[in-house]
């Protein structure tokens, strides 16, 4: 057993049939030492008399807020959460798998650029009685602060007959050096409570890996004389680290039909223009990745031919 | 060229030649994501591999005031790289295809040490720890660690040469 | 080469304050890590004070915390530490330290380079 913050405490457990639980001593948070009664939850059955209550934990049934008592009046809490650990893995019910980029993948993280700071989310099909926690630091031996405001719900999805809730967290790494190559991963600890059960769920990575620039801006065309090309123009995004002649990205531009079936012309270039043919009801698509480093590509920013 | 007495490197040619480490960093090991290479006992491997810290001057404002701090660490990790691909990390069993660009990766970062440092001018350099993994297999999986830490570390030595050819180039 | 020099230090009464002041040349100051350490007589050199390079984050030992302050002035190459309200216990060589991470780091082996000293005595 072990206290998650103020009076609540979550109990690790070993879950298969007939498993013994865990014994748990609960004590009174008070100088008083006689006329002490127990009780869980909204029930009024007195469970035990004194200072303290020794339990026997083995299911959600044990679980949950303990309270002393005296003479009808409360003295103190105690809300027992449970951890379930099957065939020596812990549960993962809360959340629910991204499968990208691989399998257990619960947290997502993205960074925009280099300052340090970063944006994690998650799902969950779970739509009541769900709180979340986020802690992070650079490295874990020495750690190094990162400051990760409140998880909130950030987006709600129908998918099938089921409904599925977007959860995410901005994170700041208080002393961000942006210029530095990362020697030691961000660590990123979500705690999940759902009723009575707790999960936890980490994610490591550094900046570098989850940088994902955003579009390009100000996509512009502008057709050259007697010429079925045009000048393609666009900016580095406003959120994109500077100076830019040291945080260097690299676009690709794309020349894309109506059909999707259409050949697909495709340009890379360091520069912040491109010569291409527009063909009539054609796009023309520009996306942005770091150009010494090949972490994610933008999403693309896009105009119309005509 | 970059002299340990403090004259200007050609921050161009120095740019060009980054750009290409970036390149071939990629292409010896383009596999993102593919493997949670930090999963695999990271510690012992290559912890020892000399990074670009806050404190080297590799920032924008570090090269203005004095470049010196920052190129010497570069050229640091250089020889050190350098040598970790011509050992037998990379030179022994399983064989690296013929046509593999860790040939090439080894040739420039010989090349850019020496635009960094000619002939006849010594910066210290940082000892190579002595990693001599026995099984094939170990080989294997400290060569992908080895091309993850260089493409991060060519990254930051091509940022700092694009600005240096951007901005501090006669 | 990398110098740290640090200076401020002496015998004062207990209660009382002294202001130590480490100048740094031969490396890049504005991307370092600041920290302070001490050594008591027969004791292990000991964590007190750090601050990250851009100052937004500060570290402190227990044994110090609302008494000793750590700041730094990027334009002098310096950071200080301002002691006050000492003690008997504060009787140590104080050394001054840079970290290439840039962190404020309590852990003596994030250190790289590292001053001489200089002996702060607090008498009752």
């Known amino acids: 057993i072990w206290e998650l913050k103020k009076d609540v405490y979550v109990v690790e457990l070993d879950w298969y049939p007939d498993a013994p639980g865990e014994m748990v001593v609960l004590t009174c948070d008070t100088p008083e030492e006689d006329g002490i009664t127990w009780t869980l939850d909204q029930s009024s059955e007195v469970l035990g008399s004194g200072k303290t209550l020794t339990i026997q934990v083995k299911e959600f049934g044990d679980a949950g807020q303990y309270t002393c008592h005296k003479g009808g009046e409360v003295l103190s809490h105690s809300l027992l959460l449970l951890h379930k650990k099957e065939d020596g893995i812990w549960s993962t019910d809360i959340l629910k798998d991204q499968k990208e980029p691989k399998n257990k993948t619960f947290l997502r993280c993205e960074a925009k650029n280099y300052s340090g700071r970063f944006t994690c989310w998650w799902l969950t099909t779970i739509s009541t009685d769900l709180t979340f926690s986020v802690k992070s630091s650079r490295g874990s031996s020495d750690p190094q602060g990162v400051t990760c405001g409140a998880a909130t719900l950030s987006a709600e999805r129908v998918r099938g007959d089921n409904k599925e809730y977007e959860y995410s967290v901005e994170c700041q790494e208080d002393s961000a050096c942006p210029a530095a190559e990362e020697s030691l991963p961000i660590e990123v600890m979500v705690d999940a409570v759902h009723k009575l059960k707790y999960e936890n769920y980490t994610s490591s990575f550094f900046i570098r890996d989850i940088i994902k620039p955003d579009p390009p801006k100000n996509l512009q065309l502008k057709p050259l004389k007697n010429s079925r090309q045009v000048e393609v123009s666009w900016e580095y995004p406003d959120t994109w680290s500077t100076p830019h002649s040291y945080f260097s990205l690299t676009f690709c531009v794309q020349v894309q039909g109506k059909s999707k079936r259409e050949k697909k012309d495709r340009v890379f270039t360091d520069k912040t223009s491109a010569t291409v043919i527009c063909r009539k009801n054609a796009s023309i698509s520009v996306r942005a990745q770091d150009r010494y480093y090949s972490s994610s590509w933008s999403e693309w920013a896009s105009v119309p031919c005509s | 060229r970059a002299v340990p007495g403090g004259s200007s490197p050609a921050w161009t040619q120095c740019q060009q030649l980054s750009q290409k480490l970036c390149t071939l960093a990629w292409s010896a090991h383009p596999l993102v994501g593919h493997m949670d290479l930090r999963e695999e006992g990271d510690e012992e491997t290559t912890n020892d591999v000399p990074h670009i810290q806050c404190g080297d001057g590799c920032d924008p404002q570090g090269l203005r005031d004095n470049s010196q701090f920052c190129l010497q660490r570069i050229h640091q990790g250089l020889i050190f790289y350098e040598k970790l691909l011509g050992s037998d990390i990379f030179t022994g069993e399983p064989s690296l295809l013929p046509d593999s660009p860790v040939g090439q990766l080894h040739a420039s970062l010989l090349g850019l040490s020496q635009l960094l440092q000619p002939e006849g001018h010594h910066w210290e350099t940082q000892q190579i720890p002595s990693l001599s993994p026995s099984q094939p297999w170990q080989r294997l999986l400290l060569r992908f660690k080895i091309l993850r830490s260089l493409q991060a570390f060519v990254a930051v030595a091509a940022r700092v040469f694009a600005h240096g050819a951007a901005t501090l180039s006669p | 080469e990398v110098q740290l020099v640090e200076s401020g230090g002496g015998s004062v009464q207990a209660g009382g304050s002294l202001r130590l002041s480490c100048v740094a040349s031969g490396l890049y100051f504005n991307g370092n890590g600041l920290g302070w350490f001490r050594q008591a007589p027969g004791k292990e050199r000991e964590f007190v004070a750090a601050?990250?390079?851009?100052?937004?984050?500060?570290n402190y030992a227990d044994s110090v915390k609302g008494r000793f302050t750590v700041s730094r002035d990027n334009i002098k190459n310096t950071v200080y530490l301002q002691m006050n309200s000492l003690k008997p216990e504060d009787t140590a060589v104080y050394y001054c330290?840079?970290?290439?991470?840039?962190?404020?780091?309590?852990?003596?082996?994030?250190?790289?380079?590292w001053g001489q000293g200089t002996q702060v005595t607090v008498s009752s």
């Open positions: 601050i990250a390079w851009n100052g937004a984050r500060i």
């Open positions: 330290a840079s970290a290439r991470s840039g962190y404020a780091s309590i852990s003596i082996n994030e250190y790289d380079y």
